[in-house]
Structure formats: C-alpha cells, structure tokens
C-alpha cells in the first residue's frame, strides 16, 4: 500500500470579506489512523483552526461528513471571513501516538487572501475658516482594505486636483491597509457652494468608487464689503443713512452704528438675502434727527463678522447744509431692514 499523502490542490484562494472560504484537502489513504487538523501558519507559533477530534470551532464547517466511514475529504469552510483571516493554511494528518498524537504528514498549504472593501472615505477640512486666496488642506482617510493596491483622486466641483500627497500604510505585508491623503485647495470668493471630493477606487468595488465629500461652506469665510449712503430726506430735519453689507459668508454678523464714536444701536443680521454664489447681503439703516445736532455728525457702520476683528465704514453728515439725496437703494435691499429714530 502506498504511503498516505495530504493533497491541498489550491495554492491560493481569494475571498471577499464577509464571505465563506473553502480550503480543500484530501488524503490519499485511510491509514495510518489519526485525526486531521488545520493550522494557519507553520512552526511552533501556528494557530489551530480545526481539530477533527475535539474542540469547538464555530466558524468552521467540514465540506464532507468527517464521521463517515472511509472519508478521505478533509476540506473545510470558514465563514464570515475578515482580513485578519489571511494567511497560509495547512491540512495536517496526525498518527495515533502514545500518549500524544504525532504529526505524520502536512499538505503543501493554501494561501488565503482576503479582498476587503475600503471604508467610506472621510474628508475633513481645516479646523478654522479661511478667506479667499488662501490655501487650505483637506485630508481623506479610508481603512480596512485588501489587497494593498488602491487609487485615490481629488476633485473640486468635478475638476480633478493635482496638488495632493497620498500614503498607504503599512508599507509591508498586512492583513489590511489604510490610505491617507492630503490635498491643497486655493479658496475663491465663489466657493461657498463648492465641494471637495475624495474618490477611492479598489478592486473590491467593481468599478464603482467610493466618495467622501466636504463642503467648502464649512471652510470658507468671505468677509463683507461695506457701503454707507445717505438716503433722501424722509421728513423735515430727518436723514436716513443706510449701511449695505455685501457678499459675506457665513451669516453670523453683528452691526453697530456709532454717532461721533458713541454706540447708538447694535443689531444682528437676521433677514438676509442670499446671492447666487451663496454669499449674503444685508442692509441696516439709521434715521438721524439732524436738529438734535449742532455740529457735523460722523456716522460709522461697524461690522463684526464671524468673530473676526470689526471692519467699519464712516459717513460724514453735514448739519449746516440742507440734506441732499446721496444715493438710492432698491426695495429688495430694504426688505427686512430695521428702522429706528434716534433722538
């Protein structure tokens, strides 16, 4: 009779994470008697995967009924595969020994490779907002994929970016890998509605890449432009002065009127109008009683936007002369403005 051989016909098996791996093994003879065991790895540190004789292996099932007479098929299935299961699996025949079984013959091994999908890319921007013309960095991270080969691209509003650096870790062999990429983006005043997209392509995704997005609205700060104008007389001795706050983002804005350096009113932007580019406009007016002033009046519109240092614009109101019409505003810009009489 020929000596038993352990046959593992598959040199390698590739399985997607979450699926079941079938590791094939047959013996060429029923003797010598003794159990089959499956191990991951070789040598003293090898990990027992299945023992025909005893033990509880909840993820492992045998392909054939190992209790059947004359069985020579010792193939196993391992369920719910994860990248941590990758490695070389050996089917090993033991011979009955006293007191312990003796390793008799091993199969050549089957390398199990696990294809694991990358996690959804997470894009994060800078901690603080930045203003147009500044360059900001965005990071993109995705984890848990295998094999190591992966492609990452950056887009801004559908246009591919080129200024980025990408690392895949670890450099050496691993059960799974992570990718980290940093892209540099120059902000423009029109970027409130812009998106930065990180796109990850991997063999497990069947040509349908994963995308992570970041809205530049979370990153950009567009500072306002101020214009103070004097409106036509409303009534004898009254002048209407408006402060137009244009093209700002985000909406958080506080406006203070100063008369000759003294605070006369403070208000918070509420009913704003939105521009096509996502920035906001707002207008505040001040009704000044000219007869209450003997000297010329310096009116200042002071705006604190998004916690930044205040910016201001001033307008000199001549008390001696009869007020002239010094500008006009559309009805839309007056909508929602606040009107107060100052005495």
């Amino acid at each position: 009779e020929e000596e038993l051989q352990v046959i593992q016909p598959d040199k390698s098996v590739l399985v997607a994470a979450g699926e079941t791996a079938t590791l094939r093994c047959t013996a060429t003879s029923l003797i010598p008697v003794g159990p089959i065991q499956w191990f991951r790895g070789a040598g003293p540190g090898r990990e027992l995967i299945y023992n025909q004789k005893e033990g509880h292996f909840p993820r492992v099932t045998t392909v054939s009924d190992l209790t059947k007479r004359n069985n020579m098929d010792f193939s196993i299935r391992i369920g719910n595969i994860t990248p941590a299961d990758a490695g070389t699996y050996y089917c090993v025949k033991f011979r009955k020994g006293s007191p312990d079984d003796v390793e008799f013959k091993s199969g050549a091994g089957t390398e199990l490779s696990v294809r694991a999908k990358p996690s959804a890319p997470v894009v994060s921007g800078p901690a603080a907002r930045a203003t147009p013309q500044h360059t900001v960095s965005f990071t993109c991270e995705s984890h848990g994929f295998s094999p190591r080969d992966i492609t990452l691209k950056w887009f801004k509003n559908g246009n591919e970016l080129s200024d980025f650096q990408t690392n895949v870790d670890p450099v050496g062999e691993s059960v799974s890998y992570s990718i980290h990429s940093t892209a540099k983006v120059v902000l423009t005043r029109e970027d409130v509605h812009s998106q930065v997209i990180c796109e990850v392509a991997h063999v497990t995704l069947q040509g349908d890449p994963l995308r992570g997005t970041a809205n530049l609205s979370e990153t950009i700060r567009v500072p306002p432009t101020l214009e103070v104008t004097q409106q036509p007389v409303r009534a004898e001795n009254q002048v209407n002065v408006t402060c137009q706050v244009r093209k700002f983002y985000p909406q958080r804005l506080q406006l203070t009127w100063l008369e000759n350096g003294n605070v006369s009113r403070t208000e918070t932007a509420s009913t704003v109008t939105e521009n096509k580019d996502g920035t906001y406009n707002w207008m505040s007016w001040l009704l000044v009683n000219v007869s209450a002033h003997r000297d010329d009046v310096k009116l200042t519109c002071q705006v604190e936007h998004d916690g930044q240092p205040a910016v201001s614009k001033s307008h000199d109101l001549k008390v001696s002369a009869h007020p002239k019409e010094q500008g006009s505003n559309t009805a839309a810009e007056n909508t929602g403005s606040n009107e107060r009489n100052i005495y």
Partner: antibody, heavy 121, light 111 residues
C-alpha cells in the same frame, strides 16, 4: 483520558427488558460513532450495532434488530442500549466501544470494562 | 454478512518461538487499496485491545513482536518471539462493512 463506563446490567427474567448505559468521558462524545459489542460467557465477540454522532444513522446486526434499540444523549455524554424480549442466549458481558482514532478507517480502539447481563428465571 | 473463520481454535507455542494465527474471510475485505482487517488481544477479565489494524498496521503502544499480513480474504497474525505475557485470546475482525463481524477466536498458550 478517554474512558467508557457501562452500567445497568443485572439479572433479568426471560421476556423482560433492561436498559444499559455507557458514560463517556475524556473526549468529545458528540463527534463519534458508538457501538455495542457483547460476549457470551466463554464465547467470542458479537457486534450488536452502532449509532452515528447525531443519531440519524443506526445500524444493527440483523438478528438483533427487532430486540435492541440503540440511542444516545450527547448532552449527557451517554450511550444507551434498550434490550427487550430477552432470552437466555442474551446472557453476556456487554461492552460499549468506539473508534476514537480511526475516524475514516474504522476499528474499535477504545472499550469499556463491560456490564454483565444475566437472563434467568 | 462477512463470515470470518479463525484457525487454529487453540495454539500452544514455546517461549521465544513464533505463533501464527490465520483468519479467512468469506469475501474480500479490501477497499480503497487497503484491507479492512483488525486483530485484537483479550486477556481474562479485560476488554479486547487492538493489536493490528488495516491488516498490517500496528496499534499505538503495541510491541513490535506483533505483526500482521495478508489481503483480500486471507490474513495472519504473527507473534515472534513469544513471551509469557502473550497468553490470551486473539480475535480477527472486519470493518469493511456492517454488520462488523469477529472471528471465533484463537486461544494462545505457552507450551
């Protein structure tokens, strides 16, 4: 240590019934086929029958099929032999046995010490 | 059923000599390239103990003086050299198919 221990033997009248037990220890009982073998005084060995791990297959020697019932309780690690309509020729030492090492090639390498059944009026 | 006929029924052998016990099957017990024939030793008051499985393979812990041979329908168990401890009953058994059957036994004694 792999052990089998039979119990339940004793004196039984002809036509009567008796249930033998075999308690297994030292191995994963639920994975193994189990057999009953008997030996009449001064005689040879006779295989009675066997049961597979999940009780879905039970084989008997044809002449004993209608008299004996083999069962098992894996939760209790115990094999049973229900004997009925016993006759004097059923007087014997009853062994339980298994093929512990030969799962593919089959032979009895583990035996209990046996329990004696005497059929007499 | 496969019937196993053992011979001789009893045998006396001098210490140090060779004892040969034969077993003939009513039909071949070969399958899968091996012979499904086993040999057991039984001493008084003890259960049987396997000596040889698959015609020629020694059981674990069995002394080398016990050997088996044969195929198909004709098998033999050899004990050489005979020792005092070998006094016992010897049985052949086929495990090719159900019902498993045993030979009638051979009583081996020291001459």
């Amino acid at each position: 240590e792999v052990k089998l221990l039979e119990s339940g033997g004793g004196l039984v009248q002809p036509g009567g019934s008796l249930k033998l037990s075999c308690a297994a220890s030292g191995f994963d009982f639920s994975r193994y086929w189990m057999s009953w073998v008997r030996q009449a005084p001064g005689k040879g060995l006779e295989w009675i029958g066997e049961i597979n791990p999940d009780s879905s297959t039970i084989n008997y020697t044809p002449s004993l099929k209608d008299k004996f019932i083999i069962s098992r309780d894996n939760a209790k690690n115990t094999l049973y032999l229900q004997m009925s309509k016993v006759r004097s020729e059923d007087t014997a030492l009853y062994y339980c046995a298994t093929s512990f090492y030969g799962s593919s090639y089959w032979y009895f390498d583990v035996w209990g010490a046996g329990t004696t059944v005497t059929v007499s009026s | 059923d496969i019937v196993l006929t053992q011979s001789p029924a009893s045998l006396a052998v001098s210490l140090g000599q060779r004892a040969t016990i034969s077993c003939r099957a009513s039909e071949s017990v070969d399958n899968y390239g091996i012979s499904f024939m086993n040999w057991f030793q039984q001493k008084p008051g003890q259960p049987p103990k396997v000596l040889i499985y698959a015609a020629s393979n020694q059981g674990s812990g069995v002394p080398a003086r016990f050997s088996g041979s044969g195929s198909g329908t004709d098998f033999s168990l050899n004990i050489h050299p005979m020792e005092e401890d070998d006094t016992a009953m010897y049985f052949c058994q086929q495990s090719k198919e159900v019902p498993y059957t045993f030979g009638g036994g051979t009583k081996l004694e020291i001459k």
